[in-house]
């Protein structure tokens, strides 16, 4: 049987396959692959904007960030309002104050601690 | 108060080098990029590339690669933006930004760069 | 690159009028984690841009409510429902969902 270089295509991963010769064939990658046979996911995570500790997690041609708990958004850079999230952040009438990267606790009639239970 | 403060406008000849610089305060330094945007003279902005401060590892637009380098020094939190050989075309007005809400949240004053011979 | 088209290129307003800008991508904004990154920011004459909506419809801290954004995929719009004279200036959008983060061109904002 005759070898046909792009029959089937060898390319994987959507590679669009083109013959360069009679044995041989060249892959046209999607954006976000690489390799002969666009086999490889190119890491998009290399100096990646994830800020205030957000983790890269690598997609096709794109990425995630996974924030801590304190912080959201596209890159780690919107504050949580903790405030809203808890209501009863702050005990015994203590007011809640959101502050960037976490939320205080204004404590009233002599009461203290980091909730006011104190 | 975050805050951006730039160095002040510069008129530099062709061929000539330049470092302007971006001191940021008002928030913890090492968490956030920093941006370098140029705006050429009655143009929209154009993102350049960002530094991290934390590790000094840089990302450039391509259309901007070679042209200039980002550096920063963590311990006057100040980030720079620098030239070896100036351009005619280099002529703009450069800012600093930091994100937040959204891409570029906050924005140094501008540096109007002016190269001409 | 994601190109970012703005219509009109100029618009001439009355004080107290509506106003409506419009924004195009080249590819759909939405990201792989479902959020659309498509910013506003306003640069008033001689001042840096300054952050006016975020993600589509979401008025940054300070933003009056005269300013809506909405919009969804490729189509968006800016609305200011009674512009005053702080309005004035250049309006763009910005995408952030590719790489790199591209503005559009800019609508300039003027006193009809």
């Known amino acids: 049987s005759l070898y046909v270089p792009c029959a089937p295509s060898p390319c994987v991963n959507g590679g669009t396959c083109r013959q360069t010769g009679d044995f041989t064939f060249e892959c046209n990658c999607l954006p976000g692959f690489e390799g002969s046979t666009c086999e490889r996911n190119i890491d998009d995570c290399p100096n990646h904007r994830c800020q205030n500790g957000g983790v890269c997690v690598d997609g096709v041609n794109t990425y995630n960030c996974r924030c801590p708990p304190q912080w959201t958004g596209q890159f780690c850079t919107e504050d949580v309002d903790e405030c809203l999230l808890q209501p009863n952040a702050c005990q015994n009438g203590g007011t809640c104050a959101n502050r960037n990267g976490g939320y205080g606790c204004v404590c009233v009639n002599g009461w203290s601690g980091d909730d006011c239970s104190e | 108060e975050v805050q951006l403060v730039q160095s002040g406008a510069e008129v530099k000849k062709p061929g000539e080098s330049l470092k302007i610089s971006c001191k940021g305060s008002?928030?913890?330094?090492?968490?956030?990029?920093i941006h370098w945007v140029r705006q050429m003279p009655g143009k929209g902005p154009e993102w350049t590339g960002y530094i991290i401060p934390g590790s000094g590892g840089t990302k450039f637009n391509e259309k901007f690669k070679g042209q200039a380098t980002i550096s920063v020094d963590k311990s006057s939190t100040t980030a720079y933006l620098q030239w070896s050989s100036l351009k005619a075309s280099d002529t703009a007005m450069y800012y600093c930004a930091r994100d937040g809400a959204g891409s570029f949240t906050y924005w140094g004053q501008g540096t109007l760069v002016t190269v001409s011979s | 690159d994601v190109l970012m088209t703005q219509t009109p290129v100029s618009l001439p307003v009355s004080l107290g009028g509506q106003v409506s800008i419009s924004c195009r991508s080249s590819q759909s904004l939405v990201h792989s984690d479902g959020n659309t990154y498509l910013h506003w920011f306003l640069q008033k004459p001689g001042q840096s841009p300054q952050l006016l909506i975020y993600r589509i419809s979401n008025r940054f801290s300070g933003v009056p409510d005269r300013f809506s954004g909405s919009g969804s995929g490729t189509d968006f719009t800016l609305k200011i429902s009674r512009v005053e004279p702080e309005d004035l200036g250049v309006y763009y959008c910005l995408q952030s969902t590719h790489f790199p983060d591209t503005f559009g061109g800019g609508t300039k904002v003027e006193i009809k």
């Open positions: 008002g928030y913890t330094f090492s968490n956030y990029v």
